[in-house]
């Protein structure tokens, strides 16, 4: 059976999933897939960890907690009403079926848009400003509200500087090999 | 074996400031998360929040924001609380512990910190 | 914030007795619940983590259920030592929250 999340069209959803490494760096592989956990492995892998690093994650999936320490939970970034269904967290630990799986269900909800007085208004009412703050654990996610000057050039700098940020983040924590697909 | 182990009662007067300190034994602190938890007597746990030493990332209870900063120093293997601007509703036994990662599995055994002209 | 409602506030009960104290969660929370005992003068001290597993060193008259938003923590046989005040806490979302505590006493 699966435990049931939720998040707003354009929101970040956040998937929770811990384990506690037997010892400080004896981390074990962690996956995350879209689907019910199989028999073994992940299907439709969007991230993955081996005993070091995040060796594996797909552009918009991502670690927002420390999984050094055990938190592997799932950060979903901008999500859309198509995230919508059940992940796999797997924690892969050594030995004949020993894997720890949590079949986790994403409701996603339509975004509430309060109607504004101009068709700018509308856009920047529609796509708040979202900035996410790096952090060990569940992701926190500001909505700084409606934007009124900003205009689609700045809105795609600011989404390029915010991926960007965040993959120089990754890359500085886990020395990753990035595929972004 | 694993302890932490904190610094002794403080009494201050209100509108002071204090840091109270927590010093890990047996395991590295940028290893853990830490944290800290308020007690007032005959009450029950209240989490203030908690530092990740290896960064020195935090995350305050929205309570304790602006009134209590954690701070940690890798050297010492010692995490620090600091409370401002102290008042009566302050007055309990400050616990720090070590989360692994979402549950406390070790305690230090409390300051109790008083505050009182 | 996740709000812990945790119950019974006290119960009284006699040695031998089993008793649950039941711990409701103002959202899921998988099983990401932990539950911890603190004697009078004491420190707390960690019971049981993720729902049900039984931390090294605590006797097996401790046992932990539920998942989602409801937790229960059973104790079988009650001991003399097992006064105490018993708290769940989540650890699945900052900031973390802890039960109001169930004060068991010995009748």
């Known amino acids: 059976s699966e435990v049931e999340y939720r998040a707003e069209v354009g929101q970040n959803a956040y998937l929770p999933c811990f384990y506690t490494p037997a010892a400080p760096g004896n981390l074990v592989p962690v996956c995350w897939g879209k689907g019910a956990c199989p028999v073994f492995e992940c299907g439709n892998v969007v991230l993955r960890t081996d005993e070091r690093d995040v060796n594996y994650w797909t552009s918009r999936y991502w670690l927002n907690g420390d999984f050094r320490k055990g938190d592997v939970s799932l950060t979903i970034e901008n999500v859309t009403l198509a995230d919508s269904g059940i992940y796999c967290c797997r924690i892969q630990i050594p030995g004949i079926m020993n894997d720890e799986k949590f079949n986790l269900k994403l409701v996603i909800k339509p975004a509430k848009v309060t109607p504004a007085p101009t068709r700018q208004r509308d856009f920047t009412a529609a796509f708040p400003r979202m900035l996410t703050t790096r952090g060990h654990g569940p992701a926190e996610t500001q909505t700084l509200g409606s934007l009124p000057d900003i205009n689609l050039t700045q809105i795609s700098t600011l989404a390029n500087e915010l991926r960007d940020s965040r993959l120089a983040n990754d890359l500085r924590d886990s020395g990753a090999t990035i595929r972004i697909g | 074996e694993v302890q932490l182990q904190q610094s002794g009662a403080e009494l201050v007067k209100p509108g002071a400031s204090v840091k109270l300190s927590c010093t890990a034994s047996d395991f590295n602190i940028k290893d853990y998360y830490l944290h800290w938890v308020k007690q007032r007597t005959e009450q029950g746990l209240e989490w203030i929040g908690r530092i990740d030493p290896d960064d020195g990332e935090t995350k305050y209870g929205p309570k304790f924001q602006g009134k209590a900063t954690i701070t940690a120093d890798t050297s010492s293997n010692t995490a620090f609380l600091q409370l401002s601007s102290l008042t009566s509703e302050d007055t309990a036994v400050y616990f720090c512990?070590?989360?692994?990662?979402?549950?406390?599995?070790?305690w230090g055994q409390g300051t109790t910190l008083t505050v009182s002209s | 914030d996740i709000q812990m409602n945790q119950s019974p506030s006290s119960l009284s009960a006699s040695l031998g007795d089993t008793i649950t104290i039941t711990c409701h969660v103002s959202?899921?929370?998988?099983?990401?619940l932990s539950w911890y005992q603190q004697k009078p003068g004491n420190i707390p001290k960690l019971l049981i983590y993720k729902a049900s597993n039984l931390h090294t060193g605590v006797t097996s008259r401790f046992s932990g259920s539920g998942a989602g938003t409801g937790f229960t923590l059973t104790i079988s046989s009650l001991q003399p030592e097992d006064i105490a005040t018993y708290y769940c806490q989540q650890g699945q979302n900052y900031p973390y929250t802890f039960g109001g505590g169930t004060k068991l006493e010995i009748k």
């Open positions: 512990s070590r989360s692994n990662p979402y549950y406390f599995d070790y």
């Open positions: 959202q899921n929370i998988n099983v990401w």
